[in-house]
């Protein structure tokens, strides 16, 4: 009956008012709909202004829903990042604390007079872990070279050892292995362990950053129209009880989120690579074993130097000549001190295993985040009809939705009946984020193979919207020279989502 309640606009008035809009705009009864730009032009309860307001609102609601979903994912990634970062930092800090507690007693002045060099090494390891563009092998080589000079001087207080003699010592030392196997072992293990730890944590940071940046990508005008039609046109057309047909909703959101779905392949690759690299957290070259035991390699090295001292000295003098004796006398009587070694293998605390199993489960859960987003938003945010039946809203009326559901991604939207998508114009922000995912995946794959990766290589593509994995304070180009070591200043490097200096946390 044309004069029945369906002709009145009471329900629309109620919904419209609940959204905070002025009720004075709402007609008392249906009016002719030639003025409608988005909804079908039958009799309607919506004026042009109402249609525009509802279109803007539906657009905002979808963006909010999208951001909410992204925020949940970001929060999960940020929590993971913080947990792993805390754990890795804790391992390194623990090792340094053990060194500071045990080395003075174990090695006396051989340690206390070089405490700065050891402190610097831990700072460099921290910087390296934070993603600074330090070459770890070079950093370690410089540390050993500097330490050898200082210890050689200390072990030979009776000799005058000018810089040119120390340079010669350094050249001789390469073949003599004064610290035994410790430097080589530490280099091999630390490179693998630190690169695994830092690339994993950086992977979490990049993933979180990508989600954040993609959530900020605006939805286009064609999407706005389609969402308005999906969500509010049923109200305007006098069928307010009709919920959107599920396939109709999916087509709208697949069209709206076509670019986002193109992240899927590289997103999966990244998460797979992250899960894979956790294999490198175990065993004798594993993260926990190595990062937590740096001090034991250092103790072994000093012991080896003391054990090899006579042979080393003889060969250095043979190669570099007899240096002058100290003009002020032979120095104190030597007291050789051997550091008692703690076991190198740290018994696993169980913390890392727990973190890894949680991370693996959560990363698997979000692997299909981008392609499942349309379905998730439809089912969670769009109050869909429970079945594809004749009673759901199909965009034109209450009835069956006949078009097939589109595939995922931009290319598959060429014939999307609900959203006009220009598949020749991919969103640039999303393309850049795909590139960031690829770069990070490559880093993780290199890290899996134990290779130190130059973290500068692709952290700036010139676009101004990278993934936050670049370096602060010119750190990436930082190279430490042996001679300038005494005047180093602490520098910071930001991992995405973290701000930290020398292991001190600030949330």
């Amino acid at each position: 009956d044309p004069a029945s309640k369906s002709r009145s606009c009471g329900e629309v008035r109620q919904i419209y008012g609940a959204k905070g809009f002025s009720l004075s705009d709402v007609p008392q009864a249906e009016i002719s709909g030639e003025h409608l730009r988005i909804c079908p032009q039958g009799y309607t309860c919506c004026t042009s202004e109402m249609e525009e307001n509802l279109a803007n609102r539906s657009h905002a609601e979808l963006e909010t829903a999208l951001r909410d979903s992204s925020r949940v994912l970001q929060a999960m990634l940020a929590t993971q990042l913080r947990s792993f970062d805390d754990h890795f930092q804790h391992l390194l800090n623990d090792s340094e604390r053990t060194l500071q507690a045990t080395f003075p007693g174990a090695f006396g002045e051989l340690y206390t007079q070089n405490a700065r060099a050891f402190r610097d090494l831990y700072s460099e390891l921290r910087l390296y872990y934070r993603g600074a563009n330090l070459h770890l092998e070079e950093t370690l080589a410089e540390f050993w070279a500097r330490l050898l000079e200082r210890l050689f001087k200390q072990l030979h207080p009776q000799l005058l050892l000018p810089d040119d003699y120390l340079d010669c010592l350094g050249k001789q030392a390469e073949a003599l292995r004064p610290f035994g196997e410790a430097p080589r072992e530490l280099r091999l293990r630390a490179t693998r362990a630190f690169v695994a730890a830092r690339s994993f944590v950086q992977g979490l940071g990049v993933a979180s950053d990508v989600v954040r940046k993609v959530a900020q990508v605006p939805l286009g005008p064609e999407c706005s129209r389609a969402v308005m039609k999906l969500v509010y046109c049923a109200h305007c057309l006098g069928v307010p009880g009709a919920r959107p047909c599920p396939d109709y909703c999916r087509n709208v959101l697949k069209g709206c989120l076509a670019n986002q779905a193109d992240l899927d392949a590289e997103w999966r690759n990244l998460l797979d690579s992250m899960v894979l690299i956790t294999d490198k957290f175990w065993g004798t070259s594993g993260v926990e074993s190595v990062i937590g035991s740096v001090h034991t390699w250092l103790a072994e090295a000093i012991n080896a130097l003391q054990d090899n001292r006579d042979t080393l000295t003889a060969k250095v003098i043979q190669g570099c000549g007899n240096p002058k004796v100290n003009p002020q006398g032979p120095g104190p009587e030597e007291k050789r001190r051997r550091g008692k070694l703690a076991p190198r293998e740290r018994p696993p605390s169980g913390t890392l295993e727990k973190l890894v199993s949680e991370a693996k489960a959560q990363l698997r859960d979000v692997q299909d985040f981008w392609i499942s987003l349309p379905g998730t938003l439809c089912s969670e945010k769009m109050a869909l009809s429970t079945a594809s039946d004749d009673r759901c809203w199909n965009g034109m009326a209450r009835g069956r939705y006949l078009p097939e559901v589109m595939g995922d991604g931009l290319a598959n939207q060429i014939n999307n009946p609900e959203v006009e998508v220009d598949i020749t114009k991919p969103d640039m922000t999303i393309r850049q984020q795909i590139m960031q995912l690829k770069i990070m995946t490559n880093r993780l794959r290199s890290a899996y193979n134990g290779n130190d990766v130059d973290f500068q290589d692709a952290s700036d593509d010139g676009s101004g919207s990278g993934s936050g994995d670049g370096c602060l304070d010119d750190l990436c180009s930082r190279k430490v020279s042996r001679k300038s070591s005494s005047s180093r200043t602490p520098l910071t490097h930001a991992l995405p989502g973290l701000s930290e200096q020398e292991g001190q946390k600030t949330s």
């Epitope: 009776q158 005058l160 006579d310 000295t313 003889a314 003098i317 007899n322 002058k324 004796v325 003009p327 002020q328 006398g329 032979p330 120095g331 104190p332 009587e333 030597e334």
Partner: antibody, heavy 118, light 107 residues
């Protein structure tokens, strides 16, 4: 040329103190430590230790810790050896010596004979 | 401490002969070894430093050799003024100890 000139012979009773001097010339006094060497009659040379002429810090070998004291008067380029509570076994010639850059004592004082007798 | 052991403790030789005195260190002294000659009532005189380098004014008939822990002083064609007591001394580490001495007498 470099010279080390020591004070003359001393005759002391047990329990007394003796202080002998060694005046250096011909080089910058504070550039090299001053060493002291003991030689008992008919015996070999024994290195007693040295004094850092920059800091004035003395270092004694184990056999000469306690009653022996090295000191300086830098302004006069002079080093001193003092022996307290003298014993008969302290009877010896005491030499001051300066070492060379690569080891060895090319420069010696003429020696000071200290005789301890009651 | 590094101990220095000299041998022989005494030795008789004739003018024109060649003699060798040896010095053994209880640890490697890395060539930081000196030889002295001392005549009765005189200060010692440096002959050799860094095991083989002759000190200024020392005749070439004197020569030093050795490495590690074993060192020797050789005197070719002994001259009358060469008789006296010879000492080795290491300069490697604290303390800079002397050997016990070798008394070289005319036969």
């Amino acid at each position: 040329q470099i010279q080390l000139v020591q004070s003359g012979p001393e005759l002391k009773k047990p329990g007394e103190t003796v202080k002998i001097s060694c005046k250096a010339s011909g080089y910058a006094f504070t550039d090299y430590s001053m060493n002291w060497v003991k030689q008992a009659p008919g015996k070999g040379l024994r290195w007693m230790g040295w004094i850092n002429t920059e800091t004035g810090e003395p270092t004694y070998t184990d056999d000469f810790k306690g009653r022996f004291a090295f000191s300086l008067e830098t302004s006069a380029s002079t080093a001193f050896l003092q022996i307290n509570n003298l014993r008969n076994e302290d009877t010896a010639t005491y030499f001051c010596a300066r070492h060379y850059d690569y080891g060895g004592f090319p420069y010696w004082g003429q020696g000071t004979l200290v005789t301890v007798s009651s | 401490d590094i101990q220095m052991t000299q041998s022989p403790a005494s030795l008789s030789a004739s003018v024109g002969e060649t003699v060798t005195i040896t010095c053994r260190a209880s640890g490697n002294v890395h060539n930081y070894l000196a030889w002295y000659q001392q005549k009765q009532g005189k200060s010692p005189q440096l002959l050799v430093y860094t095991a083989k380098t002759l000190a200024d004014g020392v005749p070439s008939r004197f020569s030093g050799s050795g490495s590690g822990t074993q060192y020797s002083l050789k005197i070719n064609s002994l001259q009358p003024e060469d008789f006296g007591t010879y000492y080795c001394q290491h300069f490697w580490s604290n303390p800079w100890t002397f050997g016990g001495g070798t008394k070289l007498e005319i036969k």
